[in-house]
């Protein structure tokens, strides 16, 4: 099907009406599915709108307002999904379609195939010449429960309106027998849980149909309630992962499809990315775009999403000489600085000559997200009440691609600094280090700086800081849990490496193997938390002996094969069917009888659970992915 993007201009239009018409035509010519809103506004009376006949489906709302044409030829529009609503209420809004000072205006709605509005109401008002709209049985079209304030259809037309053709039983879109409204819901047998194609119990449409059908199967629908998978209406598209009953794990499904609007597609359109099995225009802020096997996908960021920013003297900050109060906000959420970070007195304390206020020291916390500086770090001024550079606690690499007089790290004359606290710094790729005249700085002498270097010609000048013996005398020494590799400052989180064990970046005496709120196992010298599905053990027993839900001593909830799970598989997509299991008295999961298609409480066909008139559409993912 040919898909086009909708608009969201509401009532605003181009001042040139010719342009307005051309834009409408360009948007919707040969378009079958409008992915968004269909807005038809400010169109003159003599315009050819026959191109609108191609439209079959609108995912958002339909707005028809401020027009002068006589007939709205949306003759093939079957369904308005109402994923976005006009004024947050209406899926269909038709108003003010007449010329105030003349005889032009909307007389007839050509919506003869409109049989479904999935969400939202209808507003048809102030259409001076409009006929027949008030004869339509809107309750048959509108799916959601019927709040009277959500549908307003006034008797728009003048007294000159004709009647419906006698074969239409009083409900029509226009005057002839071809204009009768087709009812697909209010005429159905009460056993039908959706729409129908006749009055008998045998005439119910499949529950996945929207807008009616020509037969009982999921392939007979006029439109789909949820998704169209190669002509069949389905609750969900074939999932990326399917449950393998042999391995008790979710495994990659090579028949997976992605949701694109209301369609299941093998591949997203080229300008879309995959996010959780859906085709989206852009990744949400908590995810980043990556390419895997030629497919652009949204992957959750482990911490903060990568964001590269210009450094001082680069790109948008080409004119800046220092980080200052007028540019510091440009560093919010940056993980990589392309260029340099420079801190001069004119930035930290302000520069009245140049209309720059002093920096609020709290704002320096923006640098906590920075992991890489590709150029140099030059600190020649720092707020007097800040005794360390812990705002750079996540800085891993100083690239030194650009150097300051041969230096990639310069810390000069900072009397208030007592420790560096560059606790994540692992590499200074190029350039020399110059840390001098910081009269209160300690801990610097415990570090073997050359381990940070990438080349043999890098040099270190560290002098005229606080004497090492004075630091030791005042107890400004590495924490006892640090190894002999040294530290960046006081505390067990500042060690270059640990004497015993580590939890995250903190050095500890021992892992929580047998006690503590969160139990752990030892992976070498690293303490790793047990899987959340493991039950916390007492009496000197290990809670787990490795990672994952298959290494628990005992399960916290249920056990599916070797894996501890939150609950037994309940509608997980398998290779060919949905997987349902029940829990035995020992809380172990076992497959339901093959006849049970909606779950069970035991092994036999008599234990099946049956939900009348509903589709089983909540399919939680409780199994383990490899």
């Amino acid at each position: 099907q040919s898909v086009c993007a909708g608009t969201e201009n509401k009532l605003s239009s181009l001042s040139d009406l010719e342009q307005q018409y051309r834009a409408l035509r360009k948007y919707y010519e040969n378009c079958e599915v409008v992915m968004g809103n269909l807005e038809i506004t400010s169109i003159e009376h003599n315009r050819d709108l026959s191109f609108l006949r191609s439209v079959r489906e609108v995912t958002g709302y339909v707005l028809v307002a401020l027009n002068q044409f006589r007939y709205l030829p949306l003759e093939n529009l079957r369904i308005i999904r109402g994923t976005k609503l006009y004024e947050d209420r209406y899926a269909l809004a038709i108003f003010l379609n007449y010329r105030k000072d003349g005889n032009f205006g909307l007389q007839e709605l050509g919506l003869k195939n409109l049989t479904e509005i999935l969400n939202g109401g209808v507003y048809v008002d102030q259409n001076k010449f409009l006929c027949y709209a008030d004869t339509i049985h809107w309750q048959d079209i509108v799916r959601n429960p019927w709040p009277s304030n959500l549908t307003l259809v006034s008797t728009n037309g003048s007294s000159g309106c004709g009647r419906c053709h006698k074969s239409c039983t009083g409900r029509c879109w226009g005057p002839t027998e071809n204009h009768c409204q087709t009812l697909t819901r209010t005429v159905c047998a009460e056993q039908c849980d959706g729409r129908c194609y006749g009055p008998y119990v045998s005439d119910c449409c499949h529950r996945e149909c929207a807008g009616g059908c020509s037969g009982p199967k999921d392939t007979d629908c006029f439109a789909c309630m949820n998704f169209n998978d190669s002509g069949a209406c389905v609750t969900q598209c074939p999932q990326t992962f399917v449950y393998n009953p042999t391995t008790f794990q979710l495994e990659h499904n090579f028949n997976a499809k992605y949701t694109y609007g209301a369609f299941c597609v093998k591949k997203c359109p080229h300008n879309f990315v995959v996010d959780s099995s859906s085709c989206v225009r852009a990744c949400p802020s908590s995810k980043m775009e990556v390419e895997e096997n030629g497919i652009k996908m949204c992957k959750p960021c482990t911490d903060i999403c990568p964001k590269a920013c210009d450094g001082i003297g680069t790109g948008s900050l080409m004119s800046a000489q220092t980080v200052d109060s007028s540019n510091i906000d440009k560093f919010i959420n940056c993980t990589k600085i392309n260029g340099n970070l420079i801190f001069l007195v004119t930035g930290i304390h302000g520069d009245p000559y140049n209309a720059i206020e002093a920096i609020d020291p709290e704002k320096l916390n923006v640098f906590r997200t920075v992991r890489e500086i590709t150029g140099f770090l030059n600190i020649q001024s720092w707020p007097p009440n800040m005794t360390d550079f812990s705002v750079f606690s996540n800085l891993v690499t100083i690239g030194g691609r650009v150097l300051y007089s041969g230096l990639s790290l310069l810390i000069l004359k900072q009397q208030g600094i007592t420790s560096l606290q560059f606790q994540s710094l692992k590499e200074i790729s190029a350039g020399n280090i110059y840390i001098t005249d910081n009269s209160n700085l300690c801990y610097y002498h415990t570090i073997n700086w050359t381990t940070l270097f990438s080349t043999i010609n890098q040099r270190i000048v560290i002098r005229d800081n606080r004497k090492a013996e004075n630091c030791t005398a005042e107890g400004m020494v590495c924490n006892h849990l640090c190894s002999s590799d040294g530290c960046w400052g006081p505390g067990p989180d500042q060690c270059l490496s640990c004497r015993r064990f580590s939890r995250g970046r903190i050095c500890i005496e021992s892992c929580n193997l047998y006690d503590g709120e969160f139990r752990e196992f030892e992976n070498g010298s690293i303490c790793v938390e047990c899987d959340p599905q493991c039950e916390k053990m007492e009496d000197g027993l290990l809670t787990c002996h490795g990672p994952g839900p298959d290494n628990c001593t005992k399960c916290s909830h249920f056990k599916d094969g070797p894996n501890c799970v939150e609950k037994c598989p309940d509608g997980l997509q398998g290779a060919n069917s949905f997987i349902f299991k029940y829990a035995d008295p020992d809380r172990e999961c076992h497959p339901c009888h093959p006849n049970c298609t909606q779950g069970c409480n035991g092994p036999t066909s008599h234990d099946c659970i049956y939900y009348p008139w509903t589709g089983h559409s909540t399919l939680p993912q409780h199994a383990r992915t490899p």
């Epitope: 080409m318 800046a320 520069d351 009245p352 000559y353 140049n354 209309a355 720059i356």
Partner: antibody, heavy 113, light 110 residues
Framework: QVQLVESGGGVVQPGRSLRLSCAAS????????MHWVRQAPGKGLEWVAV????????YYADSVKGRFTISRDNSKNTLYLQMNSLRAEDTAEYYC??????WGQGTLVTVSS | QSALTQPASVSGSPGQSITISCTGT?????????ASWYQQHPGKAPKLMIY???NRPSGVFNRFSGAKSGNTASLTISGLQAEDEADYYC??????????FGGGTKLTVL
């Protein structure tokens, strides 16, 4: 060497507008804040306005606030002063300055009916 | 933004020393070390003589010196010379991020 050349002065009626320009050369214009200072005939210096290097901060003397607008175009190395609702007391020599050292030679604005 | 207070005129003989005062408030002169002094000859643009209370730009003779006490800045010219005859203005940064000048002092070399 730093050079600042003001232009755009002239005679204008009260209530009308005028735009002064200051062409800068001999330094990296886009890295410095710039000021306007004026001096009425036979009177003392009066500071008028300042703009930061990137245009993000602007400050004005109370006497011109709401009537004058300082702006800059870093791509053209030019500073501007848009003067609206001019009054007789705005008559002065207007200097552009790179504080505190470098000043232009000034341009004369006369507000008279 | 009231102008800083300077004496309207001072005078001295060649070779003598004179001092020009500039009184403000704690919101300008007293609150910041951004007091400057400018010399202006008739028909010419102002010339910076002292910046940041006591610093001399290159090219300014060391006969010119600046100081500050409380809310008052001062400019001292020693070894007065005929070419020192001019108007002198003090200038200070203020707490509202603006700048303010003094009313000016006419120096006459007798």
């Amino acid at each position: 060497q730093v050079q600042l050349v003001e232009s755009g002065g002239g005679v204008v009626q009260p209530g009308r507008s005028l735009r002064l320009s200051c062409a800068a050369s001999g330094f990296t214009f886009s890295s410095y804040g710039m000021h306007w200072v004026r001096q009425a005939p036979g009177k003392g210096l009066e500071w008028v306005a300042v703009i930061s290097y990137d245009g993000s901060n602007k400050y004005y003397a109370d006497s011109v606030k709401g009537r004058f607008t300082i702006s800059r175009d870093n791509s053209k190395n030019t500073l501007y002063l848009q003067m609206n609702s001019l009054r007789a007391e705005d008559t002065a020599e207007y200097y552009c300055a790179k504080y505190p050292l470098n000043w232009g030679q000034g341009t004369l604005v006369t507000v008279s009916s | 933004q009231s102008a800083l207070t300077q004496p309207a005129s001072v005078s001295g003989s060649p070779g003598q020393s004179i001092t020009i005062s500039c009184t403000g408030t704690s919101s300008d002169v007293g609150g910041y070390n951004y007091a400057s002094w400018y010399q202006q000859h008739p028909g010419k643009a102002p010339k910076l003589m002292i910046y940041e209370v006591s610093n001399r730009p290159s090219g300014v003779f060391n006969r010119f010196s600046g100081a500050k006490s409380g809310n008052t800045a001062s400019l001292t010219i020693s070894g007065l010379q005929a070419e020192d005859e001019a108007d002198y203005y003090c200038n200070s940064y203020t707490s509202s991020s603006t700048w303010v000048f003094g009313g000016g002092t006419k120096l006459t070399v007798l």
